[in-house]
Amino acid sequence: DAEQKACPPGKEPYKVDEDLIFYQNWELEACVDGTMLARQMDLVNEIPFTYEQLSIFKHKLDKTYPQGYPESLIQQLGHFFRYVSPEDIHQWNVTSPDTVKTLLKVSKGQKMNAQAIALVACYLRGGGQLDEDMVKALGDIPLSYLCDFSPQDLHSVPSSVMWLVGPQDLDKCSQRHLGLLYQKACSAFQNVSGLEYFEKIKTFLGGASVKDLRALSQHNVSMDIATFKRLQVDSLVGLSVAEVQKLLGPNIVDLKTEEDKSPVRDWLFRQHQKDLDRLGLGLQGGIPNGYLVLDFNVREAFS
C-alpha cells in the first residue's frame, strides 16, 4: 500500500512547487502534508497536476479535515472545487456569499449541478440569503434545485427569486415545498394584476389551497387543463362543479379526456352526477343522484 511507504530522504516538500509534478503517486502519498496543501491552495490551482495527483491531494485534505473543510480553505479552493463531491460539501459550513459566487463561477459549464446545488443549500443552512445574483451565478441550472432544499432552507429564499422559476422547474417538488413556494410567489407577484398575475402564478398553483382556487375562479382566468392537472387533489376536491366551470372557462371541455386520470377522476368522485350532467360533456363517475356523502375526515362533527 502506498500509504505504508516512508517518504524518501530529501523528498519532503516545504512548499507546493513545480517539483511535485514529477513525484510518483506513492511519493505524494508518503511525503505531502494536507495542511501545507491547504495553506498553499493558490499554488495547487496555479501549477497543473494530473487528475491522479489531484485525487491524492484531495485524499490528503480529507484526512486533514475529516469533519469537512474549514471556511478559510473553502474560500481558497478555486478550480480544486471541481474535485469535491456533493457529499463533501454537505459537511461544510459556508457563510460568505462571495465564496459561494466564486465557486459557482468555477463550476459553470463543468457538469457540476449537484455540487453547485449542494453549495447553495449549505450556504442557506448557515443562514445565508439566496439573492438574485446567486441565482444568476447558478446560471443555466434549472431552478428545480429549489425542490432539493429543505423547507427551512426555502424560507430564506427571497420572494424575488420566484420571477425566475419556469413551468418545469417544480415538477418534482413535494406538496410541502409547493405550498411554501406558492406563498412566496403570491408575495412576489402581489403588485401584478389581471391576466399577467395568472400567467406568473400558474406555475405555483400546485401549492394553492381550495380557498385560493375559489378566489381565482372569480377572475375569468380560463385555466388550461395542464395547469388544472397540477393542482393538488386535496384542494381540487373541495371545488364545486360551478367553481371548476368558472376556473376553466372554455377549457372545461378538456375534462372529458382526463376523466379516468387523477386528479380529475378524484374530483369527479366528489361531485353529484346531476351537477356533472349539466355540463353536457358526458362526464361519469360522480355521486349517483339521491346518495348522501358522509365525510369521515371531518372528525370534529362527531366529537
Epitope: 513545480e18 490551482n45 496555479e46 501549477i47 497543473p48 497536476f49 494530473t50 478550480h79 480544486f80
Partner: nanobody, 117 residues
Framework: QVKLEESGGGSVQAGGSLRLSCTTS?????YKWMGWFRQAPGQEREG???????????YYSDSVKGRFTISRDNAKNMIYLDMTRLRPEDSAVYEC??????????WGQGTQVTVSS
C-alpha cells in the same frame, strides 16, 4: 477544441538521440503550461519535462535532467522534446499535454519510444 498530436518516436540504440514533436491546434495563449509525460507498460504515468510559457522556464524530472530538453516554437504551435544519451529505461509511450486551471487538461495520443541495449 484543443488537439495535440505527437510524432518523432521510434527505436534507437542506447546512447542515441531522438527529437519528439507535438503539434497543437485549437490552442489558445491563455494556456500557460506545456509538458511531456511518459508511461511504460505496467507503470504509472510520470512527468518528464514541463515548460511555463509565461517566462519559458523549464522543469525536469531527476531521471532526465541534463539529457532531455523541452522547448517550444510559438509561431508554429509546436512543443519539442530533445532526448539525448537515451537509456533502456527511457522506453515508454511519450505524451504531450497542455495544463490549464491547475490540471493537465489536454493530452495527445502518444508516440512510442523504444531504446535497446
Amino acid at each position: 477544441q484543443v488537439k495535440l498530436e505527437e510524432s518523432g518516436g521510434g527505436s534507437v540504440q542506447a546512447g542515441g538521440s531522438l527529437r519528439l514533436s507535438c503539434t497543437t491546434s485549437g490552442y489558445t495563449n491563455s494556456y500557460k503550461w506545456m509538458g511531456w509525460f511518459r508511461q511504460a507498460p505496467g507503470q504509472e504515468r510520470e512527468g518528464v519535462a514541463v515548460i511555463y510559457t509565461g517566462n519559458d522556464r523549464t522543469y525536469y524530472s531527476d531521471s532526465v535532467k541534463g539529457r532531455f530538453t523541452i522547448s517550444r516554437d510559438n509561431a508554429k504551435n509546436m512543443i519539442y522534446l530533445d532526448m539525448t544519451r537515451l537509456r533502456p529505461e527511457d522506453s515508454a509511450v511519450y505524451e504531450c499535454a497542455i495544463g490549464h486551471d491547475g490540471a493537465w487538461r489536454y493530452w495527445g495520443q502518444g508516440t512510442q519510444v523504444t531504446v535497446s541495449s
